[in-house]
C-alpha cells in the first residue's frame, strides 16, 4: 500500500503560523493578509508505526522540499530539527523513528508527540517570532496544541 499524504498548514492554539527561519528552522508568529502566504505547507504522510487509542503515526515533510521534521539528541536533550533527505526515497512507509510523530487529534486540536522521545511534543513559545522546538512539558507555558488547515494539492 503506497504512502498516503495530505497537504496542510499548522497554527498553534494562539493562531500563530509557522514560517521558515533560515534554511533549517521554523518559527511561529502571527500573520495576516498576504503575509499568510509565507506559512509553510506540510506534506503530512501517514506511516507505519505504533497505533494506540488516539495516536496516528505521521511524518511531517515540507511540501516540495526535501526537508522533514526530525527529533534527535543534541547535548543530551531531545531536539527538533529540519533534516534534508534524498527525495527519491522519501516519503516511505517505514520512516526512521526520528521522523515519526504520534498525531493526537481530539476535538480538532492536534498534538505531535515524538515517537523517538515519548512525552516530548512539537511546541511553540508564547512569545512572537520564536523557534518551533521539541518541548518536554504539556499544559505549561509552552504551546503544544495546533489546528490543521487542509491545502489542496
Amino acid at each position: 500500500a503506497p504512502v498516503r499524504s495530505l497537504n496542510c498548514t499548522l497554527r498553534d492554539s494562539q493562531q500563530k503560523s509557522l514560517v521558515m527561519s533560515g534554511p533549517y528552522e521554523l518559527k511561529a508568529l502571527h500573520l495576516q493578509g498576504q503575509d499568510m502566504e509565507q506559512q509553510v505547507v506540510f506534506s503530512m504522510s501517514f506511516v507505519q508505526g505504533e497505533e494506540s487509542n488516539d495516536k496516528i503515526p505521521v511524518a511531517l515533510g515540507l511540501k516540495e522540499k526535501n526537508l522533514y521534521l526530525s527529533c534527535v539528541l543534541k547535548d543530551d536533550k531531545p531536539t527538533l530539527q529540519l533534516e534534508s533527505v534524498d527525495p527519491k526515497n522519501y516519503p516511505k512507509k517505514k520512516m526512521e523513528k526520528r521522523f515519526v510523530f504520534n498525531k493526537i487529534e481530539i476535538n480538532n486540536k492536534l498534538e505531535f508527540e515524538s515517537a523517538q522521545f515519548p512525552n516530548w511534543y512539537i511546541s511553540t513559545s508564547q512569545a512572537e517570532n520564536m523557534p518551533v522546538f521539541l518541548g518536554g512539558t504539556k499544559g505549561g507555558q509552552d504551546i503544544t496544541d495546533f489546528t490543521m488547515q487542509f491545502v489542496s494539492s
Partner: antibody
Framework: QVTLKESGPGILQPSQTLSLTCSFS??????????VSWIRQPSGKGLEWLAH???????RYNPSLKSRLTISKDTSSNQVFLKITSVDTADSATYYC??????????WGQGTLVSVSA | DIVMTQSHKFMSTSVGGRVRITCKAS??????VAWFQQKPGQSPKLLIY???TRHTGVPDRFTGSGSGTDFTLTISNVQSEDLADYFC????????FGAGTKLELK
Amino acid sequence: QVTLKESGPGILQPSQTLSLTCSFSGFSLSTSGMGVSWIRQPSGKGLEWLAHIYWDDDKRYNPSLKSRLTISKDTSSNQVFLKITSVDTADSATYYCARSAYYSFAYWGQGTLVSVSA
Amino acid sequence: DIVMTQSHKFMSTSVGGRVRITCKASQDVDTDVAWFQQKPGQSPKLLIYWASTRHTGVPDRFTGSGSGTDFTLTISNVQSEDLADYFCQQYSSYPTFGAGTKLELK
C-alpha cells in the same frame, strides 16, 4: 479505549444483499489518517480482507469481490457499513471490522456470524 | 494477488519449548508483514507488525523476523496460553493473509 462491534442479519438466503454495521467508540473517523476495514473468516478457515474506508472517504476493495461490495461510513454516528450483493453459501462466515491507520489491524471487533442458507 | 503460504497447518510443541512458524510471500513484500494470534471463538490479536516490531503489550517471547519473501514468527518459552492459530498477513499491496498454523501441545 477503542472498541468495535459488528452487527448483521445472522441468516439470509442466496441472492439477497447482506448489510453489515460496525459501531465503534474510542476514536473518530474524522481523524486524519484513520481507517476501518471489513475482514471475514469462514468457519475453520483463514482470513479474507474485503474493504477499507479512510477518514477522507477514500475506499479500497478486494479486487476479486469489488463488483459486489460497497463500503460507507457515517462519521457523526461512529459507524461503518458494508453491503455485499448476490450472496451465496460461500459468503457464510464471521465478519469482522478492524481499525487501522495502516493495514496492520491493531483493533478488532468480536465478529458477527452470517449464514447463507436456502 | 500476493499469496502468503504457511506451509505447516499444524505445529506441536511442549510448554517451555521454542517454535518457529514460517510464512512465504509469493513476491517481495519488503517488511510489510504482520502476525496475528487467534484463539477459538475470539477475534485475531495483532502480535507483530513491520515483520519484527512487537505490538504494545505483546510478551517478548514473541519475535518476528524476515524480509522480502520469507518470514518467521518465533515463540520462545511457549506457555499454555500460546496454543492458538497464528496468521501472517502482508500489506505491501491490498491485504492478504496466510491460511494459518495451529500450535498444539505435543
